[in-house]
């Protein structure tokens, strides 16, 4: 993982200062308030993950 300023995170990932590493934007579906989600190009269109069908 690269620190901010040294190299960007790879496509589909965003830097989390909270976790000190690049994180997958896909996880923003379940945890939309994560700090790195602000850096993801676009929020996934699906709503927050259902707990039960």
């Amino acid at each position: 993982e690269q620190a901010p300023g040294t190299a960007p995170c790879s496509r589909g990932r965003s830097w989390s200062a909270d976790l000190d590493k690049c994180m997958d934007c896909a996880s923003c579906r379940a945890r939309p308030h994560s700090d790195f989600c602000l850096g993801c190009a676009a929020a996934p269109p699906a709503p927050f993950r259902l707990l039960w069908p």
Epitope: L19, D24, A26, S27, R29, A30, A42, P44, R49, L50
Partner: antibody, heavy 119, light 111 residues
Framework: EVKLGESGGGLVQPGGSMKLSCVAS????????MNWVRQSPEKGLEWVAE??????????HYAESAKGRFTISRDDSRSSVYLQMNNLRAEDTAIYYC??????????WGQGTSVTVSS | DIVLTQSPASLAVSLGQRATISCKAS??????????MQWYQQRPGQSPKLLIK???KLDSGVPARFSGSGSGTDFTLNIHPVEEEDTATYYC?????????FGGGTRLEIK
Amino acid sequence: EVKLGESGGGLVQPGGSMKLSCVASGFPFTKYWMNWVRQSPEKGLEWVAEIRLKSDNYATHYAESAKGRFTISRDDSRSSVYLQMNNLRAEDTAIYYCSPTYADTMDYWGQGTSVTVSS
Amino acid sequence: DIVLTQSPASLAVSLGQRATISCKASQSVSTSTYSYMQWYQQRPGQSPKLLIKYASKLDSGVPARFSGSGSGTDFTLNIHPVEEEDTATYYCQHSWELPYTFGGGTRLEIK
């Protein structure tokens, strides 16, 4: 280096109780949801329970097979997660693993602790 | 609950050849952007280990011999070229909703 150490397994009679523990290190425990997953030859890998964060009021979720009998809890000060299992049945016999997840992936697994329910 | 059906249940592949494992979900586990499917490897006598997340993203440290593909309900794990150390059981797992469920596993033997 991430380490997960499960303990508390053993032999218990049907109807009995058991409390499993898992001590974690090497990752920011307070920021990860924690899961218990079990594995048996009969049912394969089976998710059992999940506990979320303090900011989520430690929300818990259970598989149908665990509801009403199992209770998951965590102690962030000890980087530990627990599984209290009551009214145990033969079909609860399995290896029990704890695993952290940030959102979707069970990133790390411990070595597991074996639970045998038999008379 | 979402049911994950893996096939084949077991397969034997010659060293250096390709192993292909399928996982079919009883309903879609994909958005237009991401697929919520993971693959795990469990070597004999060991705990499961995350290999692939979100259908196609290799976890850190996983060799490029492993690849994942698919979306919707149909997913595939490919290993090429297979090596001796790939002898293991492979499981798919979805994170679309609770409860999380796993496939029944595919046992890979290297000939």
